[in-house]
Interface confidence: low
C-alpha cells in the first residue's frame, strides 16, 4: 500500500484536497476520498507531508500544518503530527517557508488520514512543493 | 536498492556532487555518477535530501533546494520535490537554516536523480548536515 | 524492527527521554533504554526525528537538534544527522519553529541512538510535535 498525493490548487476547504492521478501522484492499495487517504489494510505505515507556505507581505501570522487521523467508528480526530511556525519572517516583506512532517504509525482498516493547514490562501500547490503520502512498511 | 550520500565540500558546480564511500555514506543496487543516483531497477522509491544553508551576513537571498530527475531518453528535467526560503533571517547577521525533502516516487531504469541548490557558497557540506538518499520500497 | 517514540515532558536531561508506550508511541524489535533506541538486529534503518522548539521572547539563541549513535564497544559518539538554526526569529517576540531529520543508516547490534538538543526548556513535548523513530528497511 502506497500513495503520493500532490497539491491541488482547486482546494477550497479544510482538510486539503489532493491530486491522486496526474504528474508525480500515485496511489495503490489505499483509497483517496474527499481529501483523505483511507486505509484498506491494517499495519505500520510511514506517513509524510510537506506544505509550502508563502505570502506577499509578512505579518508572521501563525502557520499550522497537521496530519490527523479519523476513524468513523470513533469520535474525534487524532493529530498524528503537527508543525507550527510563529515569528518566522521580517514584517512586511515577501516570504516563503515550508513545513515537513514524517513518521511511523500503526493504522487500522477504515482509518482516514487528512492534512490540515492554517490558511489556504498562503499555500503554493505545485506538485513538487506541497504533497502528502504514505507507504506500508 | 539503497543509497545515502553525504555532503562533498569539493562540489564546485550544480548539480551537487556527493560522497558515496566514506563515513556514513552507503550505496547498493543503484549507481552514483557525476552527482546523480542512477536507478538500476524500476519501482517505488522513498527519496530524501537535506541541505544545510548558512551565511555570514543575512540578506535573505532566496534559498532553493530541489530534487529533480532526468532520463536521457526524454528531454528536460522533472522536479520531484523542492523547497524555497525567502525572508528567513534578520539582515546583516550570521544565519543558518536547513531544508528537508522526502517522498515516494515511481522511478524507472536509467532515471538519474540530482540535487540542485541556489548558491553553492551557502552550503555546509558536513556529512550530518547535508545529504541525499533513497531506498526501494 | 520499528519504533516511534514521542515527546516526554518529564525529560530533565540530555539526551532526551521519550514515551515508548502510550498514545501514538510504538516499539517492536528494538529496545528503549534511558533515552536511547538499542539495535537488536544489524541492517539498514531509516531513522527520523522531529523537535518542536518555542519560546516567549526570541533572542535567536542557537537551536541544535542531533541524532547521534553510540556503541559501547567504541569510544565517542557519531553524529548521524543534525540541524542548527541561527537567526530565525525577530527579537523579543513569541516564536516557534521545528526541525526535522530523516535518513538511512547502516546500524549494528548494540548501537544506541539518541537525540540531543541545545536547550530543554525550549521544547514542546506534545506527541504530535516532538518524536523520534526508526524502522528496518
Amino acid at each position: 500500500s502506497v500513495a503520493h498525493l500532490t497539491g491541488n490548487p482547486r482546494s477550497r476547504s479544510i482538510p486539503l484536497e489532493w491530486e491522486d492521478t496526474y504528474g508525480t501522484a500515485l496511489i495503490s492499495g489505499v483509497k483517496y476520498k474527499k481529501g483523505g487517504l483511507v486505509i484498506n489494510e491494517a499495519g505500520l505505515y510511514f506517513v509524510y507531508s510537506k506544505v509550502y507556505f508563502r505570502g506577499q507581505s509578512c505579518n508572521s501570522q501563525p502557520l499550522s500544518h497537521k496530519v490527523y487521523m479519523r476513524n468513523f467508528k470513533y469520535p474525534g480526530d487524532l493529530v498524528l503530527m503537527e508543525e507550527k511556525k510563529l515569528n518566522y519572517c521580517t514584517t512586511g516583506q515577501i516570504w516563503a517557508h515550508s513545513s515537513y512532517l514524517g513518521a511511523v504509525f500503526n493504522l487500522t482498516v477504515a482509518d482516514h488520514l487528512y492534512v490540515n493547514i492554517s490558511q489556504l490562501s498562503l499555500i503554493n500547490f505545485e506538485e513538487s512543493k506541497t504533497f502528502f503520502g504514505l507507504y506500508k512498511l | 536498492s539503497v543509497a545515502h550520500l553525504t555532503g562533498n565540500p569539493r562540489s564546485r558546480s550544480i548539480p551537487l556532487e556527493w560522497e558515496d564511500t566514506y563515513g556514513t555514506a552507503l550505496i547498493s543496487g543503484v549507481k552514483y555518477k557525476k552527482g546523480g543516483l542512477v536507478i538500476n531497477e524500476a519501482g517505488l522509491y522513498f527519496v530524501y535530501s537535506k541541505v544545510y544553508f548558512r551565511g555570514q551576513s543575512c540578506n535573505s537571498q532566496p534559498l532553493s533546494h530541489k530534487v529533480y530527475m532526468r532520463n536521457f531518453k526524454y528531454p528536460g528535467d522533472l522536479v520531484l520535490m523542492e523547497e524555497k526560503k525567502l525572508n528567513y533571517c534578520t539582515t546583516g547577521q550570521i544565519w543558518a537554516h536547513s531544508s528537508y525533502l522526502g517522498a515516494v516516487f515511481n522511478l524507472t531504469v536509467a532515471d538519474h536523480l540530482y540535487v540542485n541548490i541556489s548558491q553553492l557558497s551557502l552550503i555546509n557540506f558536513e556529512e550530518s548536515k547535508t545529504f541525499f538518499g533513497l531506498y526501494k520500497l | 524492527s520499528v519504533a516511534h517514540l514521542t515527546g516526554n515532558p518529564r525529560s530533565r536531561s540530555i539526551p532526551l527521554e521519550w514515551e515508548d508506550t502510550y498514545g501514538t508511541a510504538l516499539i517492536s524489535g528494538v529496545k528503549y533504554k534511558k533515552g536511547g533506541l538499542v539495535i537488536n538486529e544489524a541492517g539498514l534503518y531509516f531513522v527520523y526525528s522531529k523537535v518542536y522548539f518555542r519560546g516567549q521572547s526570541c533572542n535567536s539563541q542557537p537551536l541544535s537538534h542531533k541524532v547521534y549513535m553510540r556503541n559501547f564497544k567504541y569510544p565517542g559518539d557519531l553524529v548521524l544527522m543534525e540541524e542548527k538554526k541561527l537567526n530565525y526569529c525577530t527579537t523579543g517576540q513569541i516564536w516557534a519553529h521545528s526541525s526535522y531529520l530523516g535518513a538511512v543508516f547502516n546500524l549494528t547490534v548494540a548501537d544506541h541512538l539518541y537525540v540531543n538538543i541545545s536547550q530543554l526548556s525550549l521544547i514542546n513535548f506534545e506527541e504530535s510535535k516532538t518524536f523520534f523513530g526508526l524502522y528496518k528497511l
Epitope: 508563502r54 506577499q56 507581505s57 514584517t91 512586511g92 516583506q93 515577501i94 516563503a96 503554493n124 505545485e126 | 540578506n59 535573505s60 537571498q61 532566496p62 532553493s64 524555497k84 525567502l86 525572508n87 539582515t91 541556489s118 | -
Partner: antibody, heavy 119, light 106 residues
C-alpha cells in the same frame, strides 16, 4: 555589461491586450528576480509586478492584479508582461528592472517601452 | 499600503550647494529604503540601498541617512550632472515609491 532591453510597446485601444518583452544580457538571468515598473507621462514610478528567478512565484500590484501576467523564459533570457483588459490609466513607460536582493530594490533598468491606451 | 512622501517636490539649487531631500513613510519601514536618480527620457539609476549604503560606482558626494519613518538624501556639493529627479522607494512591504523631487538649476 548588464543590459535589459524592453520591446512590444505601442498604441492600443481600451479593453485590448498587449505583450511586452524584456531581453536580458550580461548576467546570469536565471538567478535573478525581475520586476516591471511603470511611469505614467509626467508622473512618478509605480511598481507593477515581480517574478521569482525560476518563474515559480509571481506577485502583482493591486492595480494590475487579475489583468496582467508576468512570466519569463530562462532559456531565452527573456521576461514578459502580458497585459489584458487595458485601461487608459495603464498608459505609461514600462521598465523591466533587475532585483538586487530578495525582491527589494533594482540595480539595473531597461530603457523602457511606451504603452499608450487610447481610443 | 505604505505611502512615501518626498519633500520638497521641486528644489532649486546651484552648483557647489549642499542639498537635502526628505522622504517620509506613512509607517515605520526600518531601514528598508532605496534612492534613485532619473534624468528626462532615461531610466532611473540606482544610488543607495538600506537607507545609507552607497551603491558601487556612485560618487561619494551622495549619502543617505535615517530609519523608521524619516529619511534624507544629501548631495554634499552639487555637480552639473546631478540636476535630475530623485525618488525614494520603500521595500518593507511590497514596493512603493515617493512622488519624486525635481532638482533644478537656480
Amino acid at each position: 555589461q548588464v543590459q535589459l532591453v524592453e520591446s512590444g510597446g505601442g498604441v492600443v485601444q481600451p479593453g485590448r491586450s498587449l505583450r511586452l518583452s524584456c531581453a536580458a544580457s550580461g548576467f546570469t538571468f536565471s538567478t535573478y528576480g525581475i520586476h516591471w515598473v511603470r511611469q505614467a507621462p509626467g508622473k512618478g514610478l509605480e511598481w507593477v509586478a515581480v517574478i521569482w528567478y525560476d518563474g515559480s512565484d509571481k506577485f502583482y500590484a493591486d492595480s494590475v492584479k487579475g489583468r496582467f501576467t508576468i512570466s519569463r523564459d530562462n532559456s531565452k533570457n527573456t521576461l514578459y508582461l502580458q497585459m489584458n483588459s487595458l485601461r487608459a490609466e495603464d498608459t505609461a513607460v514600462y521598465y523591466c528592472a533587475r532585483d538586487r536582493d530578495n525582491w527589494n530594490y533594482f540595480d539595473y533598468w531597461g530603457q523602457g517601452t511606451l504603452v499608450t491606451v487610447s481610443s | 499600503d505604505i505611502q512615501m512622501t518626498q519633500s520638497p517636490s521641486t528644489l532649486s539649487a546651484s552648483v557647489g550647494d549642499r542639498v537635502t531631500i526628505t522622504c517620509r513613510a506613512s509607517q515605520s519601514i526600518s531601514s528598508w529604503l532605496a534612492w534613485y536618480q532619473q534624468k528626462p527620457g532615461k531610466a532611473p539609476k540606482f544610488l543607495i540601498y538600506q537607507a545609507s549604503s552607497l551603491e558601487s560606482g556612485v560618487p561619494s558626494r551622495f549619502s543617505g541617512s535615517g530609519s523608521g519613518t524619516e529619511f534624507t538624501l544629501t548631495i554634499s556639493s552639487l555637480q552639473p550632472d546631478d540636476f535630475a529627479t530623485y525618488y525614494c522607494q520603500q521595500y518593507n512591504s511590497y514596493i512603493t515609491f515617493g512622488q519624486g523631487t525635481r532638482l533644478e538649476i537656480k
